[in-house]
């Protein structure tokens, strides 16, 4: 028979004959023959092959190297990677999530718009006219300023985007 | 010309191990694997395992682990297969085998006391 | 593992006979990978068919193989006396490879 130029899916070309890929959690040990079909064996202990492959190693499973600030999310298998998050009040450098950074705080006069997760840093929004943040903090949004009238008082100083109202009581001597 | 030559008759006691050579000749010994089979007397043909020269794995029949070690020498083109702890259930003939296309001539192995 | 079973067992022939010898397997065997050994008394096997249908170089035409799936056979022509020999059938589709159980093919 003609020698085949293309082969199907999950099938590769080598010394002029389809051979078998390996499938995901295996790795190539010997091309398949005329006589036999392709050998392949699975993947050791904290490796793995994702893809239908002709690989003849195993990738290592991402190590969460503690010391960066990295823990396991998610428990590698044959057939995935392992996937890194980082510990409580960090968050990962790059999508990759090699090494991890303390999440930001936002300054007196920014609150929180988006609290930080384990992939993404916190995201910080200037107090707007009537509210105020005092604190350096990653979890604090912007307060409201307190309310004079409400409590039938009246605005003694006036409150910025770092500091709240100051209310004092009304002047009783006005006619 | 391709050629498997294996060693002559064995008589071995129950208990003790025992070293088959195959020696290759005729093409380029790491490109093919080898296959070691099996034979009682009277019987079919059983497969042991099979060892890439080229990167030393060796694949064997679940039924044999244990029981079988296959090794190569690859500076003088020959494959091993030593087999342990016999007993008369592992009296045969042993044949090596290119990926079967070619086979060596069988060494009888007879474990006997 | 697959399972090889071969049929019949043994068999006689009167030269110039047409033989056909089965091989049924437990499960399908991938790319055709199964093939025909001839073994001759005191001999090693010798490769006949392989891949089902490819003659080996140097076996005789009167030699053929066919078959798919699970169901394979291996035909002889005509006998002629030096086919006098045990026949066996193999995959090589999954591990652990496996042979059929022989047939045994004597003259009449």
């Known amino acids: 028979p003609e020698p085949p130029t293309a082969c199907r899916e999950k099938q590769y070309l080598i010394n002029s004959q389809c051979c078998s890929l390996c499938q995901p959690g295996q790795k190539l040990v010997s091309d398949c023959t005329e006589f036999t079909e392709t050998e392949c064996l699975p993947c050791g202990e904290s490796e793995f092959l994702d893809t239908w492959n002709r690989e003849t190693h195993c990738h290592q499973h991402k190590y969460c190297d503690p010391n960066l600030g990295l823990r396991v999310q998610q428990k590698g298998t044959s057939e995935t990677d392992t996937i890194c998050t980082c510990e409580e009040g960090w968050h990962c450098t790059s999508e990759a999530c090699e090494s991890c950074v303390l999440h930001r705080s936002c300054s007196p006069g920014f609150g929180v718009k988006q609290i930080a997760t384990g992939v993404s840093d916190t995201i910080c929004e200037p107090c707007p006219v009537g509210f105020f943040s005092n604190v350096s903090s990653a979890f604090e949004k912007c307060h409201p300023w307190t309310s004079c009238e409400t409590k039938d008082l009246v605005v003694q100083q006036a409150g910025t985007n770092k500091t709240d109202v100051v209310c004092g009581p009304q002047d009783r001597l006005r006619a | 010309e391709v050629q498997l030559q294996q060693s002559g008759p064995e008589l071995v006691k129950p208990g003790a191990s025992v070293k088959i050579p195959c020696k290759a000749s005729g093409y380029t010994f790491t490109d093919y694997n080898m296959d070691w089979v099996k034979q009682s007397h009277g019987k079919s043909l059983e497969w042991i395992g099979d060892?890439?020269?080229?990167?030393?794995?060796?694949i064997y029949n679940q039924k044999f682990r244990g029981k079988a070690t296959l090794t190569v020498d690859k500076s003088s083109s020959t494959a091993y297969m030593e087999l342990r702890s016999l007993t008369s259930e592992d009296t045969a003939v042993y044949y090596c085998a290119r990926r079967f296309a070619y086979w060596g001539q069988g060494t009888l192995v007879t474990v006997s006391a | 593992e697959i399972v090889l079973t071969q049929s019949p067992t043994t068999m006689a022939a009167s030269p110039g006979e047409k033989i056909t010898i089965t091989c049924s397997a437990s499960s399908s065997i991938s790319s055709n990978y199964l093939h025909w050994y001839q073994q001759k008394p005191g001999s090693s096997p010798k490769v006949l068919i392989y891949r089902t249908s490819n003659l080996a170089s140097g076996v005789p035409v009167r030699f053929s193989g066919s078959g798919s799936g699970t169901s394979y056979s291996l035909t002889i022509g005509t006998m002629e006396a030096e086919d006098v020999a045990t026949y066996y059938c193999q995959q090589g589709s999954s591990i652990p490879y496996t042979f059929g159980g022989g047939t045994k093919l004597e003259i009449k």
């Open positions: 060892i890439n020269p080229n990167n030393d794995i060796s």
